[in-house]
């Protein structure tokens, strides 16, 4: 066979997609079906990952690389290499042990995954609430109350810009 042999370890010459059997004069045999070796010098091939059930195949396995999975619609990946699939919830909800639950008042979730997070406390930054929060959206903070003209509501969006001293028509 045509292959340069390493003086230290003949198996180091076996490329990805093959395995080296020490008992067989260091021949690089192809990985059997449904297995792979992604690096050279392997003495065994690894079984391909199967994307079954809630997992679906994002990238097919080959003799040189493992399959990659993602999740079927309605689920999202968790963990390294999408090791788990977690159920999606609607915006404004979070996943609990009992399923998807609406965010409690004062919290929001603008994604289909993750937990409900507290609305921003505008007053901590010396600002006022410009737009109220909802289950799906955080509050929008605006200028501090002192910056607002007398009588302006802190929860109404600012009126269109106009000349100072003029009343709206």
């Amino acid at each position: 066979f045509e292959r340069t042999r390493s003086l230290q370890d003949p198996c180091s010459n076996c490329p990805a997609g093959t395995f080296c059997d020490n008992n067989r004069n260091q021949i690089c045999s192809p990985c059997p079906p449904n297995s792979f070796s992604s690096a050279g010098g392997q003495r065994t091939c690894d079984i391909c990952r199967q994307c079954k059930g809630v997992f679906r195949t994002r990238k097919e396995c080959s003799s040189t690389s493992n399959a990659e999975c993602d999740c079927t619609p309605g689920f999202h990946c968790l963990g390294a290499g999408c090791s788990m699939c977690e159920q999606d919830c609607k915006q404004g909800q979070e996943l609990t042990k009992k399923g998807c639950k609406d965010c409690c008042f004062g919290t929001f979730n603008d994604q289909k995954r993750g937990i409900c997070r507290p609305w921003t406390n505008c007053s901590l930054d010396g600002k006022s609430v410009l737009v109220n929060g909802t289950k799906e959206r955080d509050v929008v903070c605006g200028p501090s109350p002192a910056d607002l003209s007398p009588g302006a509501s802190s929860v109404t969006p600012p009126a269109p810009a106009r000349e100072p001293g003029h009343s709206p028509q």
């Epitope: 066979f1 021949i27 079906p33 080959s62 003799s63």
Partner: antibody, heavy 114, light 106 residues
Framework: DVQLVESGGGLVQPGGSRKLSCAAS????????MHWVRQAPEKGLEWVAY????????YYADTVKGRFTISRDNPKNTLFLQMTSLRSEDTAMYYC???????WGQGTTLTVST | QIVLTQSPAIMSASLGEEITLTCSAT?????MHWSQQKSGTSPKLLIY???NLASGVPSRFSGSGSGTFYSLTISSVEAEDAADYYC?????????FGGGTKLEIK
């Protein structure tokens, strides 16, 4: 869908040369080693040659060593078998096969005869 | 090189019958693959690494064995199973095929 399509077969005189090609599609060709396997008329299967995904490892059956050369062009998704000093016993259907042996081409017929 | 001997060379079976094809190796091999070739078509992988069914292969096919002796069993033969069956090993160079078993349906 995975497809392997061989071409280049035909009638060749003894001592002549021929180059077979195999066009691959439907899978990541550069991620797989490839084989050539042949089948003489009314006979069994015989492994001919193997090339690894990156062409660094090549093996031949003793019956073709020194006469046949396996190669590949990964950007073009094509496998080749250059055959020289052909003999009548090389007459066969030639299949290109993915290294998992899970997909075979439809084959191309080589006839070596005067 | 490792020589694979298949027996019987020709087998005739009735519909619904259970049959076993065997493959004997001159030296121990790590595992065996089996392929099926119907008349006028390319071979198709049937069983890989001794006992794993290839994609789309009916569950009536099964494989077993180790070392120098391997077998392929069809639990209930159907008309579409008429074909040549080859064992092949890819662990010991040069890689080799058995001579094949032709299955005929009575």
């Amino acid at each position: 869908d995975v497809q392997l399509v061989e071409s280049g077969g035909g009638l060749v005189q003894p001592g002549g040369s021929r180059k077979l090609s195999c066009a691959a599609s439907g899978f990541s060709f550069s991620s797989f080693g490839m084989h050539w396997v042949r089948q003489a008329p009314e006979k069994g299967l015989e492994w001919v040659a193997y090339i690894s995904s990156g062409s660094s490892t090549i093996y031949y059956a003793d019956t073709v060593k020194g006469r046949f050369t396996i190669s590949r062009d990964n950007p073009k998704n094509t496998l080749f078998l250059q055959m020289t000093s052909l003999r009548s016993e090389d007459t066969a259907m030639y299949y290109c096969v993915r290294d998992w042996t899970d997909y075979w081409g439809q084959g191309t017929t080589l006839t070596v005869s005067t | 090189q490792i020589v694979l001997t298949q027996s019987p060379a020709i087998m005739s079976a009735s519909l619904g019958e259970e049959i076993t094809l065997t493959c004997s190796a001159t030296s121990s091999v790590s595992y065996m693959h089996w392929s099926q070739q119907k008349s006028g078509t390319s071979p198709k992988l049937l069983i890989y690494t001794t006992s794993n069914l290839a994609s789309g292969v009916p569950s009536r096919f099964s494989g077993s064995g180790s070392g120098t002796f391997y077998s392929l069993t069809i639990s209930s033969v159907e008309a579409e199973d008429a074909a040549d069956y080859y064992c092949h090993q890819w662990t010991t160079y040069p890689w080799t095929f058995g001579g094949g078993t032709k299955l005929e349906i009575k």
